[in-house]
């Protein structure tokens, strides 16, 4: 007997983080033998949706014309071939932004940082939240969580970064969220650039900025400076 059918690939276009009201397309790609595709959403009656394959039958499209809270969540897909159902795909987490008012992102002691020094990014929300996320643009793994230890609501989260180097130049935004659904995020904060000056790699003041604690290529996730919780919040990796 042949082994289990290979699991399909699941992804979203234009991406998995979608603003409220925008359209998103979920794709499930299996094999040419696929006869039907099924999309399941966690905590929803299964299947969440079924679609016939598009020619040449190796993938199916699931369309969301206007993103709302109801669509945010964790998805998996399967396909059916003549020999049965496939393994489930790796999960896709579809996140909606715009659920809450935007927080403010600022820098202590200053937004212009000398290379090798330290900086703390502060994400502050008007109303108490229990999760804060720091986003670095154009990073492959952009999310750094600070989540409340005991469901305690916080107005802010601190992201200490040290040492700052020009290698991690970029623009940062933050989001806030409630624990009951980490798939629902606030509007993004206004962007904050952390300008790194006087770096060893480039003696000229540079308009690029960085705020990371680990040296490494651009697409590495931000690294926290330590595991000590700040403001009752705990670090999580995406």
């Amino acid at each position: 007997q042949a082994g289990p059918l290979p699991k399909p690939t699941l992804w979203a276009e234009p991406g998995s983080v979608i603003s409220w009201g925008n359209s998103v397309t979920i794709w499930c790609q299996g094999t040419l033998e696929a006869r039907e595709y099924r999309l399941d959403k966690e905590e929803s009656p299964a299947p969440w949706d079924r679609q016939n394959p598009l020619e040449p039958k190796n993938k199916a499209r699931f369309s969301i014309p206007s993103m709302t809270e109801d669509y945010a969540g964790r998805y998996r897909c399967y396909y059916r071939s003549p020999v049965g159902w496939s393994q489930p795909s790796d999960p896709l987490e579809l996140v909606m932004t715009g659920a809450y008012s935007k927080p403010t992102l600022s820098a202590l002691p200053s937004p212009l940082v000398t290379s090798g020094k330290s900086v703390t990014l502060l994400c502050q929300s008007r109303s108490p939240m229990d999760t804060f996320l720091l986003i670095k643009e154009r990073a492959a793994h952009p999310l750094l969580h600070l989540r409340s230890e005991h469901g305690a609501q916080q107005h802010q989260a601190e992201f200490p970064m040290s040492p700052v180097t020009s290698v991690h130049g970029g623009t940062y935004r933050c989001f806030s969220s409630h624990g009951f659904s980490h798939y629902l995020l606030s509007h993004p904060s206004d962007p904050l650039e952390l300008i790194v000056s006087g770096s060893l790699e480039d003696p000229r003041p540079s308009p690029t900025r960085s705020v990371s604690t680990a040296a490494g290529p651009e697409d590495q996730p931000l690294m926290p400076t330590g595991s000590v919780p700040h403001s009752g919040l705990r670090r999580h990796w995406e």
Epitope: L108, P109, S110, S118, L122, P191, E193
Partner: antibody, heavy 119, light 112 residues
Framework: EVQLLESGGGLVQPGGSLRLSCAAS????????MSWVRQAPGKGLEWVSV????????YYADSVKGRFTISRDNSKNTLDLQMNSLRAEDTAVYYC????????????WGQGTTVTVSS | DIVMTQSPLSLPVTPGEPASISCRSS???????????LDWYLQKPGQSPQLLIY???NRASGVPDRFSGSGSGTDFTLKISRVEAEDVGVYYC?????????FGQGTKLEIK
């Protein structure tokens, strides 16, 4: 009413130590970064140090780095400045100040406490 | 470090007349977010400093509207539309764009 009240100043010999305290009231202390600023006799203002709301991040002027330590106790609403290896040029009035929302501006200041370093 | 230079260092003013203080920084304080990281403080005789203006042009809470801040980049101005006797003291500008935060030398405003 938002208030900051410094204490701990006094006369100390060069090389000695002193610990300044600042008692805060009238606001959610843990939500705000706090700073120390000093003013030498007849001179202008000089920033000394700042600490984030949680106390997890601290920053210093080069002139005091390695000698001064800023800390806070959010359960007691107090800000401290431990000053070691004091020099004559550390003689000043030391003010504690609360930073405003989003770290913009020092919007509340204490009355100051005088530190004199002299033999 | 960013150097802050104020002028004039002494400013005698007649009550009811306008007053203007200039502050220049050794490098631009305009950040990419559109904010100028410059504050103005007033230290009245025998008192602690108080915040007047933050981010270049935003009046702090409780500050009379006769005080205004303007400028961008490296050149900033604090204006008092009509000076009152209670405005006497030393005015300081301070940059917060880059640590260490640095103050200007101060401008002493006195009544003629």
């Amino acid at each position: 009413e938002v208030q900051l009240l410094e204490s701990g100043g006094g006369l100390v010999q060069p090389g000695g130590s002193l610990r300044l305290s600042c008692a805060a009231s009238g606001f959610t202390f843990s939500s705000y970064a706090m700073s120390w600023v000093r003013q030498a006799p007849g001179k202008g203002l000089e920033w000394v140090s700042v600490i984030s709301g949680s106390g997890g991040s601290t920053y210093y002027a080069d002139s005091v780095k390695g000698r001064f330590t800023i800390s806070r106790d959010n359960s007691k609403n107090t800000l401290d400045l431990q000053m070691n290896s004091l020099r004559a040029e550390d003689t000043a009035v030391y003010y504690c100040a609360k930073l405003g929302d989003y770290y913009y501006g020092m919007d509340v200041w204490g009355q100051g406490t005088t530190v004199t370093v002299s033999s | 470090d960013i150097v802050m230079t104020q002028s004039p260092l002494s400013l005698p003013v007649t009550p009811g007349e306008p007053a203007s203080i200039s502050c220049r920084s050794s490098q631009s304080l305009l950040h990419s977010n559109g904010y100028n990281y410059l504050d103005w403080y007033l230290q009245k005789p025998g008192q602690s400093p108080q915040l007047l203006i933050y981010l270049g042009s935003n009046r702090a809470s409780g500050v009379p509207d006769r005080f205004s801040g303007s400028g961008s980049g490296t050149d900033f101005t604090l204006k008092i539309s009509r000076v009152e006797a209670e405005d006497v003291g030393v005015y300081y500008c301070m940059q917060a764009l880059q640590a260490p935060w640095t103050f200007g030398q101060g401008t002493k405003l006195e009544i003629k």
